[in-house]
Protein backbone atom coordinates (compact mmCIF):
# COMPACT_ATOMS: atom_id res chain seq x y z
CA UNK A 1 0.00 0.00 0.00
CA UNK A 2 1.02 3.67 -0.12
CA UNK A 3 3.63 4.64 2.45
CA UNK A 4 2.96 7.55 4.76
CA UNK A 5 5.14 9.71 7.02
CA UNK A 6 3.84 10.47 10.50
CA UNK A 7 5.21 11.70 13.81
CA UNK A 8 8.98 11.58 14.27
CA UNK A 9 9.42 10.06 10.81
CA UNK A 10 7.74 13.07 9.25
CA UNK A 11 9.97 15.48 11.20
CA UNK A 12 13.05 13.48 10.18
CA UNK A 13 11.93 13.62 6.56
CA UNK A 14 11.44 17.38 6.63
CA UNK A 15 14.78 17.85 8.37
CA UNK A 16 16.45 15.81 5.64
CA UNK A 17 14.71 17.46 2.71
CA UNK A 18 14.81 21.04 3.97
CA UNK A 19 18.15 21.05 5.78
CA UNK A 20 19.19 24.40 7.25
CA UNK A 21 16.22 26.17 5.68
CA UNK A 22 13.77 24.82 8.24
CA UNK A 23 10.17 23.93 7.47
CA UNK A 24 6.51 24.67 8.09
CA UNK A 25 3.79 22.25 9.16
CA UNK A 26 1.22 24.38 7.37
CA UNK A 27 1.75 26.12 4.06
CA UNK A 28 2.48 29.81 4.56
CA UNK A 29 -0.44 32.21 4.15
CA UNK A 30 -0.92 33.18 0.51
CA UNK A 31 0.63 29.94 -0.70
CA UNK A 32 -0.85 28.77 -3.99
CA UNK A 33 -4.31 29.78 -5.11
CA UNK A 34 -6.42 28.64 -2.15
CA UNK A 35 -9.56 30.66 -1.54
CA UNK A 36 -10.15 32.44 1.76
CA UNK A 37 -12.79 29.92 2.77
CA UNK A 38 -10.69 26.85 2.03
CA UNK A 39 -9.25 25.19 5.14
CA UNK A 40 -5.48 25.44 5.46
CA UNK A 41 -3.78 22.28 4.27
CA UNK A 42 -0.99 20.93 6.41
CA UNK A 43 1.73 18.41 5.80
CA UNK A 44 0.09 15.94 8.16
CA UNK A 45 -2.98 15.94 5.90
CA UNK A 46 -0.86 15.52 2.81
CA UNK A 47 1.88 13.12 3.92
CA UNK A 48 0.57 11.29 6.99
CA UNK A 49 -3.11 10.78 6.17
CA UNK A 50 -2.12 10.28 2.53
CA UNK A 51 1.16 9.38 0.87
CA UNK A 52 3.21 12.14 -0.71
CA UNK A 53 6.18 12.44 -3.03
CA UNK A 54 9.37 14.40 -2.46
CA UNK A 55 8.13 17.46 -4.33
CA UNK A 56 5.22 17.70 -1.88
CA UNK A 57 7.61 17.51 1.08
CA UNK A 58 9.80 20.23 -0.45
CA UNK A 59 6.80 22.55 -0.62
CA UNK A 60 6.90 22.80 3.18
CA UNK A 61 10.52 23.94 3.34
CA UNK A 62 11.11 27.54 4.39
CA UNK A 63 12.41 29.76 1.60
CA UNK A 64 16.14 30.12 1.18
CA UNK A 65 17.47 33.20 2.94
CA UNK A 66 19.10 35.53 0.42
CA UNK A 67 22.82 35.99 0.92
CA UNK A 68 23.68 39.29 2.61
CA UNK A 69 25.53 41.65 0.33
CA UNK A 70 28.44 43.60 1.79
Amino acid sequence: GPETLCGAELVDALQFVCGDRGFYFNKPTGYGSSSRRAPQTGIVDECCFRSCDLRRLEMYCAPLKPAKSA
Partner: nanobody
Framework: QVQLQESGGGLVQAGGSLRLSCAAS????????MGWYRQAPGKERELVAT???????NYADSVKGRFTISRDNAKNTVYLQMNSLKPEDTAVYYC????????????WGQGTQVTVSS
Protein backbone atom coordinates in the same frame (compact mmCIF):
# COMPACT_ATOMS: atom_id res chain seq x y z
CA GLN B 1 31.71 12.71 12.19
CA VAL B 2 30.05 10.42 9.66
CA GLN B 3 31.83 9.17 6.55
CA LEU B 4 29.88 8.01 3.50
CA GLN B 5 31.31 5.89 0.70
CA GLU B 6 29.31 5.38 -2.48
CA SER B 7 29.94 2.64 -5.02
CA GLY B 8 28.22 0.98 -7.96
CA GLY B 9 28.26 3.75 -10.53
CA GLY B 10 29.38 3.23 -14.09
CA LEU B 11 28.47 3.30 -17.75
CA VAL B 12 25.31 1.48 -18.82
CA GLN B 13 23.14 1.41 -21.91
CA ALA B 14 19.64 2.86 -21.90
CA GLY B 15 17.19 0.34 -20.48
CA GLY B 16 19.87 -1.21 -18.29
CA SER B 17 20.21 -1.40 -14.52
CA LEU B 18 22.69 -0.36 -11.83
CA ARG B 19 22.72 -0.74 -8.07
CA LEU B 20 24.35 1.99 -6.02
CA SER B 21 25.50 1.41 -2.45
CA CYS B 22 26.39 3.88 0.26
CA ALA B 23 28.08 2.67 3.42
CA ALA B 24 28.15 4.92 6.48
CA SER B 25 30.94 4.71 9.03
CA UNK B 26 32.05 6.71 12.05
CA UNK B 27 29.54 8.12 14.53
CA UNK B 28 26.56 6.23 13.13
CA UNK B 29 24.39 5.40 16.12
CA UNK B 30 21.55 7.68 15.08
CA UNK B 31 20.97 8.08 11.36
CA UNK B 32 17.20 8.35 11.05
CA UNK B 33 17.07 9.43 7.43
CA MET B 34 19.13 8.52 4.41
CA GLY B 35 18.74 9.34 0.75
CA TRP B 36 20.15 9.86 -2.70
CA TYR B 37 20.58 13.08 -4.65
CA ARG B 38 21.89 13.51 -8.17
CA GLN B 39 23.46 16.34 -10.09
CA ALA B 40 23.66 16.43 -13.87
CA PRO B 41 26.14 18.76 -15.60
CA GLY B 42 24.93 22.35 -15.50
CA LYS B 43 21.89 21.47 -13.37
CA GLU B 44 20.97 21.87 -9.71
CA ARG B 45 21.29 18.97 -7.31
CA GLU B 46 18.03 17.00 -7.29
CA LEU B 47 16.65 14.83 -4.51
CA VAL B 48 15.91 11.39 -5.95
CA ALA B 49 14.80 9.12 -3.11
CA THR B 50 14.75 8.96 0.68
CA UNK B 51 14.26 6.26 3.28
CA UNK B 52 13.54 6.43 6.99
CA UNK B 53 14.97 4.15 9.67
CA UNK B 54 11.63 2.35 9.54
CA UNK B 55 12.09 1.96 5.77
CA UNK B 56 9.36 4.38 4.68
CA UNK B 57 10.35 5.49 1.19
CA ASN B 58 9.67 8.57 -0.91
CA TYR B 59 10.65 9.23 -4.52
CA ALA B 60 10.90 12.02 -7.04
CA ASP B 61 8.27 11.73 -9.76
CA SER B 62 10.96 11.34 -12.41
CA VAL B 63 12.20 8.02 -10.97
CA LYS B 64 9.05 6.56 -9.42
CA GLY B 65 8.48 3.00 -10.59
CA ARG B 66 12.03 2.68 -11.92
CA PHE B 67 14.23 3.29 -8.86
CA THR B 68 13.98 1.53 -5.50
CA ILE B 69 15.72 2.74 -2.34
CA SER B 70 16.40 0.34 0.51
CA ARG B 71 18.58 0.19 3.58
CA ASP B 72 20.29 -2.35 5.79
CA ASN B 73 20.34 -0.85 9.28
CA ALA B 74 22.68 -3.56 10.58
CA LYS B 75 25.25 -2.59 7.94
CA ASN B 76 24.43 1.15 7.99
CA THR B 77 24.12 0.98 4.24
CA VAL B 78 21.60 2.46 1.83
CA TYR B 79 21.05 1.16 -1.69
CA LEU B 80 19.55 2.58 -4.86
CA GLN B 81 18.41 0.02 -7.40
CA MET B 82 18.04 1.79 -10.73
CA ASN B 83 16.14 -0.01 -13.49
CA SER B 84 15.02 1.06 -16.97
CA LEU B 85 17.72 3.71 -17.00
CA LYS B 86 17.40 6.63 -19.41
CA PRO B 87 20.06 9.00 -20.80
CA GLU B 88 18.52 11.77 -18.66
CA ASP B 89 19.46 9.77 -15.54
CA THR B 90 23.12 10.54 -16.30
CA ALA B 91 24.51 12.40 -13.30
CA VAL B 92 26.76 12.21 -10.28
CA TYR B 93 24.77 10.45 -7.55
CA TYR B 94 25.36 11.50 -3.96
CA CYS B 95 24.38 9.73 -0.79
CA UNK B 96 23.34 11.84 2.19
CA UNK B 97 22.33 11.15 5.78
CA UNK B 98 20.91 13.23 8.58
CA UNK B 99 22.37 12.83 12.06
CA UNK B 100 19.72 13.53 14.69
CA UNK B 101 22.15 14.13 17.55
CA UNK B 102 23.71 17.06 15.69
CA UNK B 103 20.39 18.79 15.19
CA UNK B 104 19.81 17.37 11.75
CA UNK B 105 23.22 18.06 10.25
CA UNK B 106 23.43 16.51 6.78
CA UNK B 107 26.51 14.53 5.78
CA TRP B 108 27.36 13.95 2.13
CA GLY B 109 29.29 11.32 0.23
CA GLN B 110 31.78 12.14 -2.52
CA GLY B 111 29.47 10.95 -5.28
CA THR B 112 29.54 8.24 -7.92
CA GLN B 113 29.17 8.86 -11.65
CA VAL B 114 26.33 7.19 -13.53
CA THR B 115 26.38 7.51 -17.32
CA VAL B 116 23.54 6.16 -19.43
CA SER B 117 24.29 5.96 -23.14
CA SER B 118 21.63 5.83 -25.82
Amino acid sequence: QVQLQESGGGLVQAGGSLRLSCAASGNIFDLPYMGWYRQAPGKERELVATISIGSTTNYADSVKGRFTISRDNAKNTVYLQMNSLKPEDTAVYYCAVVHRSTGGYKYWGQGTQVTVSS
